[in-house]
């Protein structure tokens, strides 16, 4: 038998994908667990295999459909159980009833790129991804900018309150490297939460003009 | 063919009550989740409730459900409402319909609806 | 729950014009599904996830729309299109349908 302190947190990305954790103290790490889905509504069911990602504990993604596919509505509710092999049976570690819509969290916004720079500003733009038609403009972003010397736990956050895919970052040192990032969350759902951030923009502000003799 | 043929409608007083059935057939009933809807005379489509494939979820329009009931027998593929402390305002035609999906769900098929009368 | 207004609630049109009908919802949905009744009859699932023609369906009827505000539209009316028509959304319990838009002959 399993034992210790059993979480189990789940994340729909608004389309086609529910990702899960599931982190067990005490667990056996050769154990073989899924997480199986089964929405009350509709007639299919879906099964990820749980592989390790730390010590204790393990990650799944349950991909229900095509990427831009919109497999759950606010209205669907997803039984989700961890079910890890004990000999010949399958024994139930952990179960959740799953509401998608108050535990989204989207996929990381991509297609980062510089629309202009300048030697104190740079403009950036994005794109989000695989996020369901119905948020609209119902969105907020938060963006962050690594300087030299500093770590991106040290970047000051820029919030964006409203569904706004550029930015126009001001005060920028000239000819100095930069890193930009951005995440994305929906304003619904009870336990929403950001999601992970893109992939870092690498840019370079333009040197200052010399001046004249 | 996916039929659901409704039954049991009627006169009825008000103050009493009145049970409806919805048999259906040319699909597994047992796999799909069935509803109850409405309409008044002249009027538009009001959703009464729904039922799911095990009958362990059943959901009501909020104004409805201290007086409406829905139950459902697998075995016998058939759908039921009833219906207690009838009201002139229920006189209607009763519409059971099965729930589908592609992405969003709806109702795919409906039944030919069943009276209901209730006057003094 | 969401309320759904359709406009208008009947209009007059002519064999071959072009109609369009407006379903409008209080908050946000993820579709809007659209019903056909004649008198007497059931309802018939005519358009869902708001713009995929059920099965039999003309392809002169088409659905779009997003957010709040959604639209059926007939691109050439027939005699045969001479009905009630009801927008729908389940994006939240409970599920709510428009007050109809009779579509009558001129």
């Known amino acids: 038998a399993v034992n210790g302190t059993s979480r189990f947190t789940c994340f729909y990305n608004s389309r086609a994908n529910i990702s899960c954790v599931w982190s067990q103290d005490g667990a056996l790490q050769d154990t073989s667990c899924q997480v199986h889905a089964w929405p009350d509504r509709r007639r299919w069911n879906q099964t990820c295999e749980l592989l390790p990602v730390s010590q204790a504990s393990w990650a799944c993604n349950l991909i229900l459909g095509t990427p831009d596919s919109q497999k759950l509505t606010a209205v669907d509710i997803v039984t989700l159980r961890v079910m890890c092999r004990e000999g010949v049976r399958w024994r139930m570690m952990a179960i959740q009833d799953f509401k998608p819509f108050e535990n989204l969290r989207l996929m990381a916004p991509i297609s980062l790129q510089v629309v202009h720079v300048e030697t104190h500003r740079c403009n950036i733009s994005w794109k989000i991804s695989q996020a369901s038609h119905y948020f609209e403009r119902h969105l907020e972003f938060e963006a962050r900018t690594l300087s030299p010397g500093h770590t991106w736990e040290e970047a000051p956050l820029m919030t964006l309150k409203q569904k706004q895919e550029w930015i126009c970052l001001e005060t920028l040192t000239p000819d100095t490297q930069y890193e930009f990032q951005v995440r994305v969350k929906p304003l619904q759902g009870e336990f929403t939460t950001w999601s992970p951030w893109s992939q870092p923009l690498a840019f370079r502000t333009k040197p200052a003009a010399l001046g004249k003799d | 063919e996916v039929q659901l043929v409704e039954s049991g409608g009627g006169l009825v007083q008000p103050g009493g009550s009145l049970r409806l059935s919805c048999a259906a057939s040319?699909?597994?009933?047992?796999?799909?989740?069935m509803s109850w809807v409405r309409q008044a005379p002249g009027k538009g489509l009001e959703w009464i409730g729904e039922?799911?494939?095990?009958?362990?979820?059943?959901n009501y329009a909020p104004s409805l459900k201290d007086r409406f009931t829905i139950s459902r027998d697998n075995a016998k593929n058939s759908l039921y409402l009833q219906m207690n402390s009838l009201r002139a305002e229920d006189t209607a035609v009763y519409y059971c319909?099965?729930?589908?999906?592609?992405?969003?769900?709806?109702?795919?098929?409906w039944g030919q609806g069943t009276t209901v009368t209730v006057s003094s | 729950d969401i309320q759904m207004t359709q406009s208008p609630s009947s209009l007059s049109a002519s064999v071959g014009d072009r109609v369009t009908i407006t379903c409008s919802a209080s908050?946000?949905?993820?579709?809007m599904h659209w019903y056909q009744q004649k008198p007497g009859k059931a309802p018939k699932r005519w358009i869902y996830?708001?713009?995929k023609l059920a099965s039999g369906v003309p392809s002169r009827f088409s659905g779009s729309g997003s957010g709040t505000e959604f639209t059926l539209t007939i691109s050439s009316l027939q005699p045969e299109d001479f009905a009630t028509y009801y927008c729908?959304?389940?994006?939240?319990?409970?599920?709510?349908f428009g007050g109809g838009t009779k579509v009558e002959i001129k």
């Open positions: 729908q959304q389940w994006s939240s319990n409970p599920p709510t």
């Open positions: 908050s946000r949905v993820i579709y």
């Open positions: 996830d708001t713009s």
């Open positions: 039922i799911n494939p095990d009958s362990s979820t059943i």
């Open positions: 319909a099965r729930h589908d999906y592609d992405e969003g769900i709806y109702f795919d098929y």
């Open positions: 040319g699909f597994d009933f047992s796999r799909y989740w």
